[in-house]
């Protein structure tokens, strides 16, 4: 089989601070040295890019400075964290992995992680 399998959790609940973390694991058919990981959000059949990072195997995963994502990599596993989430951001977050180099190129699409975000209740004013 030439397809690359990507595994990710089915459901994740964001913290009260709007932070959600999940692991994206891929079964590499070859020895990739350059990998691109993209987080996509799917809502009502529309797909948008949340963040993306290209890394060399053995090096750290680096997202752009203004990205809402951070991450670390270890072998064929990527630990992804998405920050600044609000209730309206609840949705399906798909992990996409591309083995860019060396040839052949492989594409792997995960089934998606449903991230639930609940906005925290505002603190009541203190009478003290």
């Amino acid at each position: 089989c030439k397809a690359m399998h990507v595994a990710q959790p089915a459901v994740v609940l964001a913290s009260s601070r709007g932070i959600a973390s999940f692991v994206c694991e891929y079964a590499s058919p070859g020895k990739a040295t350059e990998v691109r990981v993209t987080v996509l959000r799917q809502a009502d059949s529309q797909v948008t890019e949340v963040c993306a990072a290209t890394y060399m195997m053995g090096n750290e995963l680096t997202f752009l400075d203004d990205s809402i994502c951070t991450g670390t990599s270890s072998g064929n596993q990527v630990n992804l964290t998405i920050q600044g989430l609000r209730a309206m951001d609840t949705g399906l977050y798909i992990c996409k992995v591309e083995l860019m180099y060396p040839p052949p190129y492989y594409l792997g699409i995960g089934n998606g992680t449903q991230i639930y975000v609940i906005d925290p209740e505002p603190c009541p004013d203190s009478d003290f």
């Epitope: 089989c1 030439k2 397809a3 690359m4 399998h5 058919p29 350059e34 691109r36 993209t38 996509l40 797909v47 948008t48 890019e49 993306a52 290209t54 798909i94 996409k96 860019m100 180099y101 040839p103 052949p104 190129y105 492989y106 594409l107 699409i109």
Partner: antibody, heavy 118, light 108 residues
């Protein structure tokens, strides 16, 4: 409007060269991989070449390897195909296509005709 | 290289009838990586189905895809006059990206 527009096709003699261009508009060009696909008269679709987001990685069909070079300029939202040592069998309509976020070629240009004949 | 073989080469169908097109891969293709395209004379191909069964934006629900492994199917439930065209399957899970040779759906 989200679109791709190819240009640069024409008639060229065997052994000659041609440079195709593809102008992208209406989307963040650097967030997508890009491809060239060709179609010989009356024939099916044949993938020609691929280029990664930043242009660092490039792949080619065996039939054009060593003769064609793909490149992109993200600042200009443009994709290119430099075709050298052209042969009669390279005669085709050449399409640029966007590699969609989930992988399929979700946006195509209108195509540009390349004819290689003496 | 994954070779895709489409059948039949030509399908003659009357408007309103059902059309079933087949695409067979030389080795297993993950269902997430199989697409179908429609091409009319003088036009560029248009994405119909991706991920074996998901309809692209704006594609009517009379088009449906199914299958897994090495066998995939495109079904057009009720052929409209504008559906007479050539249809291609494609795998995009690994390089080289490959297309089937196409199935022409013509008016009977």
């Amino acid at each position: 409007e989200v679109q791709l527009v190819e240009s640069g096709g024409g008639l060229v003699k065997p052994g000659g060269s041609l440079r195709l261009s593809c102008a992208a508009s209406g989307f963040t060009f650097s967030s997508y991989t890009m491809h060239w696909v060709r179609q010989a008269p009356g024939k099916g679709l044949e993938w020609v070449s691929f280029i990664s987001y930043d242009g660092n990685q490039k792949y080619y069909a065996d039939s054009v390897k060593g003769r064609f070079t793909i490149s992109r300029d993200n600042a200009k939202n443009s994709l290119y195909l430099q075709m050298n040592s052209l042969r009669a069998e390279d005669t085709a309509v050449y399409y640029c296509a966007r590699g969609g976020l989930l992988g399929p070629f979700d946006l195509w240009g209108q195509g540009t005709m390349v004819t290689v004949s003496s | 290289e994954i070779v895709l073989t489409q059948s039949p080469g030509t399908l003659s169908v009357s408007p309103g009838e059902r059309a079933t097109l087949s695409c067979r891969a030389s080795q297993s293709v993950g269902s997430s990586y199989l697409a179908w395209y429609q091409q009319k004379p003088g036009q560029a191909p248009r994405l119909l189905i991706y991920g074996a069964f998901s309809r692209a934006t704006g594609i009517p629900d009379r088009f449906s895809g199914s299958g897994s492994g090495t066998d995939f199917t495109l079904t057009i439930s009720r052929l409209e006059p504008e559906d007479f065209a050539v249809y291609y399957c494609q795998q995009y899970g690994s390089s080289p990206w490959t297309f089937g040779q196409g199935t022409k759906v013509e008016i009977k």
